[in-house]
Each structure stands twice: as structure tokens, then as C-alpha cells.
């Protein structure tokens, strides 16, 4: 069971990143699915290595002073959402913005029907060029 | 099937990084090989988690003004090369240069004879000290 | 065999990071254990994918001029410690400090009783907020 999906620009104002089965994507079988273009949902309980990579372009003057943060989050059936992993990068002084990449990854127990998704502080700063922003998992 | 190889400084002007089976490297068996010191080639079709880490030292005045980009690329038999993953970092203002690290990783389907390699915008900026720059894969 | 542990602030002056089985941690069975809150120790020989993520907050005026370095290290029974992976980031100019994240990961052969741990140049700069700093492994 494995998946690797590709970032998709979105006009939605939500902080949850959007993904698509496009380009060189992976969706091994129907035991993992991409739902609503925003979350990877698994049908089998078990340990999964889950990862995300986000490239973004920001500038410290144009942004709020808070850093850019990417969060890998979990929603299990009947449970509250919870943060699994986060990473942060301070904004660049490049103009109009400077590129930076964040990588997240870890091993987590997922229940049947559990979904994982990626949140960022400012989706408008995310880079959607080939290979720069992606999200996936693999069952151990 | 798994491999982990270590970066090697090269006098070649190519943007493709060079690797070696040295230090604490991994080469599980002959179903994955390091070819010409530049690419990991697999004999078996399947899903692989492929990763690379590149540490580099750059300065925005001494460098071209473009960001440092690392790309994980795929060459399948009879196919064009394609980019699997990329990451970028804007240059530092540290003198003579500032260290930064990039990590790439994802799950991809590889065909028999497929090769993966790592490209960077400026190989002369790559840090080859112990543990800083490496490349590997594992079959799921 | 898999583990994922969460960073813990420590009053110790050691450069070795401290970890805990808290929050959304993973400890699959007793074939991997967290020892003294500082190292993951495995009982079975084999290939492991080992990873660490460290988020830190530093400022180039307040810090030494040397970059922040995170190292993934190995101690095998009867052997000297050795560095498996390292990553570096130059300090930010943000005030009072700028957040940055480092991710390390690779495939390594571990012997029975081998331990892996994470070293940083300045533990006081590490960010221990939910999800920012973690450490884990999985057996292939």
C-alpha cells in the first residue's frame, strides 16, 4: 500500500493543500485513496511512513513576521484532528520572494478510515512547479 | 533491495552529482547497482522509496542570483529523463558562504533497468564532508 | 519493527537530544527501545531506514558564526561512534531568532544492540513544540 500525489494550485482560501493524481504519481491500489483532492485515506490499520515536501516562495517584508509552517495532520474516525509533524522556515529577503523547501516524514499508526493531510500557513506561497511539492505514504 | 551511497567530489563539470560506495554505505545485493558513480539502477520492477540529501554552501553575491535547486531524476529504458522531485533554497548572505541542507524523498514505480540520479544547479557548492550529502533507495 | 519518538526539552548540557514516548509516538514492539531518553536501540540485525527532524530557532548575531548542525550517529557494540548523516543550516537574521527545519534520513545496516542518536550543535535552540522535532526508524 503506497501513494505519492502531486500538488495542485487551488483558488480555495483554505490552508489545506490540494493534491492530484497527475504526473509521475503513485496509487498502489484501492486500500489508499485521495479524497476531495486534499487527504490520503487508508482502509487498513497499520504502521505507515508518511511524508510531505513543500516548496514555497516568501519574503520577510511581504509576509507576516511569523515563519512559514507546514503541518502533517491526522483525522481518525470519531477523533479530533491532530498534528503529526510540523516544520518551519523563516522568510527569505529575496525579492519578490525567495524559494525554500521543507520535508516532513515519520512512522505513525493509522486506523481504518484514517486520513492524513497537509496544512500550511499561506497556500498562496506554495510552489507547484514539477516535483517541488508532493505528499505520500507507504505501509510498512 | 536497498542502497545508500555517499557523495564524492568530482572534477567533472556536469550537474549530475557523483556517488561512491564508501564510508557507511549500503548496497544490499546486486538487484541495485551504482553505475558510473552517478546513478542507482534497479533490476526489479516495483515501488521504491527514493531519497537524497544535499548540503551546499552558497552566498548570494558570489552565486548566480538564482536559487540552488536539487532534482531527483529518473531515466527508464527507452524513455526520456523525467524529474521526480525537486527542492530549492535561496542563497545565504553568510560569508564566504552559508551552509544549507535539502532533503528529497518519495515513493515511485520503477521499471527493470530504470536509473535514478541527482542533479544540482551548481555542483561546486555541494558539501562532501562526512554525512552531509547522500542518496539512496529501498524497495517496498 | 518501527519507532517514532518525540523531542523533550532537557536541562542537561549535552549535545545529544532527548526523546520521549509521548504524544503520537510509535514503538511497535520490544525489538526497538528508547534507552535513557536519548537513543533508539535495536535487537535485530538488518537494514533500517532511520530519520530525524529537527526544528531550531537561531539568530546569526546571537549564535556563534558556525552553522547549526544536526547529526544522526551510530553506536554499535564494541565499536566507536560514527556519524551516519548530517545536515546544516546557516543562522537566520530574524529577531530574536528565525525558525528553520532540518530533515535527515537514510538506509543503514544495524547490528544487534546497535543504538542511534541525534546530536546538535546547540540544544538550547531546538524547538520542542508539537511535531517540530522527532526521531524514528523502521526495519525494511
Amino acid at each position: 500500500i503506497a501513494a505519492h500525489v502531486i500538488s495542485e494550485a487551488s483558488s480555495k482560501t483554505t490552508s489545506v493543500l490540494q493534491w492530484a493524481e497527475k504526473g509521475y504519481y503513485t496509487m498502489s491500489n484501492n486500500l489508499v485513496t485521495l479524497e476531495n483532492g486534499k487527504q490520503l485515506t487508508v482502509k487498513r490499520q497499520g504502521l505507515y511512513y508518511i511524508y510531505a515536501q513543500v516548496t514555497f516562495c516568501s519574503n520577510r517584508e511581504a509576509s507576516s513576521q511569523a515563519p512559514f509552517i507546514a503541518s502533517l495532520c491526522l483525522k481518525s474516525p470519531g477523533r479530533f484532528e491532530r498534528i503529526l509533524l510540523r516544520a518551519a522556515n523563516t522568510h527569505s529577503s529575496a525579492k519578490p520572494c525567495g524559494q525554500q523547501s521543507i520535508h516532513l516524514g515519520g512512522v505513525f499508526e493509522l486506523q481504518p478510515g484514517a486520513s492524513v493531510f497537509v496544512n500550511v500557513t499561506d497556500p498562496s506561497q506554495v510552489s507547484h512547479g514539477t516535483g517541488f511539492t508532493s505528499f505520500g505514504l507507504l505501509k510498512l | 533491495i536497498a542502497a545508500h551511497v555517499i557523495s564524492e567530489a568530482s572534477s567533472k563539470t556536469t550537474s549530475v552529482l557523483q556517488w561512491a560506495e564508501k564510508g557507511y554505505y549500503t548496497m544490499s545485493n546486486n538487484l541495485v547497482t551504482l553505475e558510473n558513480g552517478k546513478q542507482l539502477t534497479v533490476k526489479r520492477q516495483g515501488l521504491y522509496y527514493i531519497y537524497a540529501q544535499v548540503t551546499f554552501c552558497s552566498n548570494r553575491e558570489a552565486s548566480s542570483q538564482a536559487p540552488f535547486i536539487a532534482s531527483l531524476c529518473l531515466k527508464s529504458p527507452g524513455r526520456f529523463e523525467r524529474i521526480l522531485l525537486r527542492a530549492a533554497n535561496t542563497h545565504s548572505s553568510a560569508k564566504p558562504c552559508g551552509q544549507q541542507s535539502i532533503h528529497l524523498g518519495g515513493v515511485f514505480e520503477l521499471q527493470p533497468g530504470a536509473s535514478v540520479f541527482v542533479n544540482v544547479t551548481d555542483p561546486s557548492q555541494v558539501s562532501h564532508g562526512t554525512g552531509f550529502t547522500s542518496f539512496g533507495l529501498l524497495k517496498l | 519493527i518501527a519507532a517514532h519518538v518525540i523531542s523533550e526539552a532537557s536541562s542537561k548540557t549535552t549535545s545529544v537530544l532527548q526523546w520521549a514516548e509521548k504524544g503520537y509516538y510509535t514503538m511497535s514492539n520490544n525489538l526497538v527501545t528508547l534507552e535513557n531518553g536519548k537513543q533508539l536501540t535495536v535487537k535485530r540485525q538488518g537494514l533500517y531506514y532511520i530519520y530525524a527532524q529537527v526544528t531550531f530557532c537561531s539568530n546569526r548575531e546571537a549564535s556563534s558564526q558556525a552553522p547549526f548542525i544536526a547529526s544522526l550517529c551510530l553506536k554499535s557494540p564494541g565499536r566507536f561512534e560514527r556519524i551516519l548523516l548530517r545536515a546544516a543550516n546557516t543562522h537566520s537574521s530574524a529577531k530574536p531568532c528565525g525558525q528553520q527545519s532540518i530533515h535527515l534520513g537514510g538506509v543503514f545496516e544495524l547490528q544487534p544492540g546497535a543504538s542511534v542518536f541525534v546530536n546538535v550543535t546547540d540544544p538550547s535552540q531546538v524547538s520542542h513544540g508539537t511535531g517540530f522535532t522527532s526521531f524514528g526508524l523502521l526495519k525494511l
Epitope: 525579492k95 510552489s127 517541488f132 | - | -
Partner: antibody, heavy 118, light 107 residues
Framework: QVQLVQSGAEVKKPGSSVKVSCKAS????????ISWVRQAPGQGLEWMGW????????NYAQKFQGRVTITADESTSTAYMELSSLRSEDTAVYYC???????????WGQGTLVTVSS | DIQMTQSPSSLSASVGDRVTITCRAS??????LNWYQQKPGKAPKLLIY???SLQSGVPSRFSGSGSGTDFTLTISSLQPEDFATYYC?????????FGQGTKVEIK
């Protein structure tokens, strides 16, 4: 040597759209930003927007927001600027230029004259 | 938007003269100020970036100074090929904006 070569002059009717191309050669086009700047006859320079070609990030001047779209094709090293709902005051020479770290524009295309007239 | 005001809007000078053009920003732009030269029918050419860095290939008679809100372009000894229009541009904040230009003419 970096060269930016733009598409030819256009004559357009009010209310229509124009799409100007800018093809780069001789350098790493895709790693840099591309800005679009226009200059009305006898007037000064006006910045319209920016794209980072391989990354896909864009920034637009508020004045043109909703009317201008800047895109890029990494495979052909070409950037595009499309301006819609044209009016007579959009008559100008449109330049593409490569932008670097500090927001300076170091290489410029030769310019494309767009005339909007009924 | 940040307003960029150049002065003078035009000047007459002779070959060998020292020429100074000033550019004032309506708010602080740190050192994110660039200078361009434009000749009739041609695209602008970058002279100075980041307030005082000389662009490669540009003669050393051109220099830039200033930070914050007040900036200066100096041509130490005017040459015949320097008769043109000069623009300053701020790249600190979106939208990037240009000064209205200073035309340097032959006296």
C-alpha cells in the same frame, strides 16, 4: 549570453485580449524570475507582474489584478503575458525582463508594441 | 504603493561633467533600489542594483549610493554615449515601481 526574444507587434480591438511571449536562450531561464514591464508612448516604465518559471509562483501589481495572467512553459523556456479587456490606454511597448535576487532586472527583451484601436 | 520621485526630470550637461540624479522613495525601501539607462527605441539597461552594486559590464564611472528613502546615481565624467533617460526602481514592495525618469541632454 542570455537573450530574451519577444513575439511580434500586435494590433487589437478594445475589449479583446493579447498574449505576448518571451523566449529565453543562453542561460538558466527557469531558475530566475521573469517580470513584465510596459511603457506607454512617451511615458515612463510600469511594472505589471512577475513569475518564477519553474516554481510557478506569481506576483501581480494590484492595478492589473484580474486582467493580467503571467505563465511560463519550462520545457520551451518561454514566459507569457496575457492582458484581457484591452482599452486604448493599454497601447504600449511590453517588455519581459529577467529578475534576480534583489528584484533588479538584468536582461530585457526587445519589446513588443501592442496597439489597441477600434 | 511606494512612490518614487526623481529629480531633476531633465538636465543639460557637457561631456566630462559630473552628473548626479536623485531618487526619493515615499517610505523606506532599505537598499532595494536599482538604476536603469534607456535610449530611444531601446529596452532599458541595468546599471546599478541593490543601491550601490555595479552591474557587470557597466563602466565604473557609474556609481550608486543611499539607503532608506534617499538615493543617488552619479556619473563621474559624462561620456557621449551616456546621453539617455535614467530610471530608478524600487523592488522592496509589490508592486515594484519606477521613478518618472531623468532625461540627460547635451548642453
Amino acid at each position: 549570453q542570455v537573450q530574451l526574444v519577444q513575439s511580434g507587434a500586435e494590433v487589437k480591438k478594445p475589449g479583446s485580449s493579447v498574449k505576448v511571449s518571451c523566449k529565453a536562450s543562453g542561460g538558466t531561464f527557469s531558475s530566475y524570475g521573469i517580470s513584465w514591464v510596459r511603457q506607454a508612448p512617451g511615458q515612463g516604465l510600469e511594472w505589471m507582474g512577475w513569475i518564477s518559471p519553474i516554481f510557478g509562483n506569481t506576483n501581480y501589481a494590484q492595478k492589473f489584478q484580474g486582467r493580467v495572467t503571467i505563465t511560463a512553459d519550462e520545457s520551451t523556456s518561454t514566459a507569457y503575458m496575457e492582458l484581457s479587456s484591452l482599452r486604448s490606454e493599454d497601447t504600449a511597448v511590453y517588455y519581459c525582463a529577467r529578475s534576480r535576487y534583489y528584484g533588479d532586472l538584468d536582461y530585457w527583451g526587445q519589446g513588443t508594441l501592442v496597439t489597441v484601436s477600434s | 504603493d511606494i512612490q518614487m520621485t526623481q529629480s531633476p526630470s531633465s538636465l543639460s550637461a557637457s561631456v566630462g561633467d559630473r552628473v548626479t540624479i536623485t531618487c526619493r522613495a515615499s517610505q523606506s525601501i532599505s537598499s532595494y533600489l536599482n538604476w536603469y539607462q534607456q535610449k530611444p527605441g531601446k529596452a532599458p539597461k541595468l546599471l546599478i542594483y541593490y543601491a550601490n552594486s555595479l552591474q557587470s559590464g557597466v563602466p565604473s564611472r557609474f556609481s550608486g549610493s543611499g539607503s532608506g528613502t534617499d538615493f543617488t546615481l552619479t556619473i563621474s565624467s559624462l561620456q557621449p554615449e551616456d546621453f539617455a533617460t535614467y530610471y530608478c526602481q524600487q523592488s522592496d514592495s509589490i508592486p515594484w515601481t519606477f521613478g518618472q525618469g531623468t532625461k540627460v541632454e547635451i548642453k
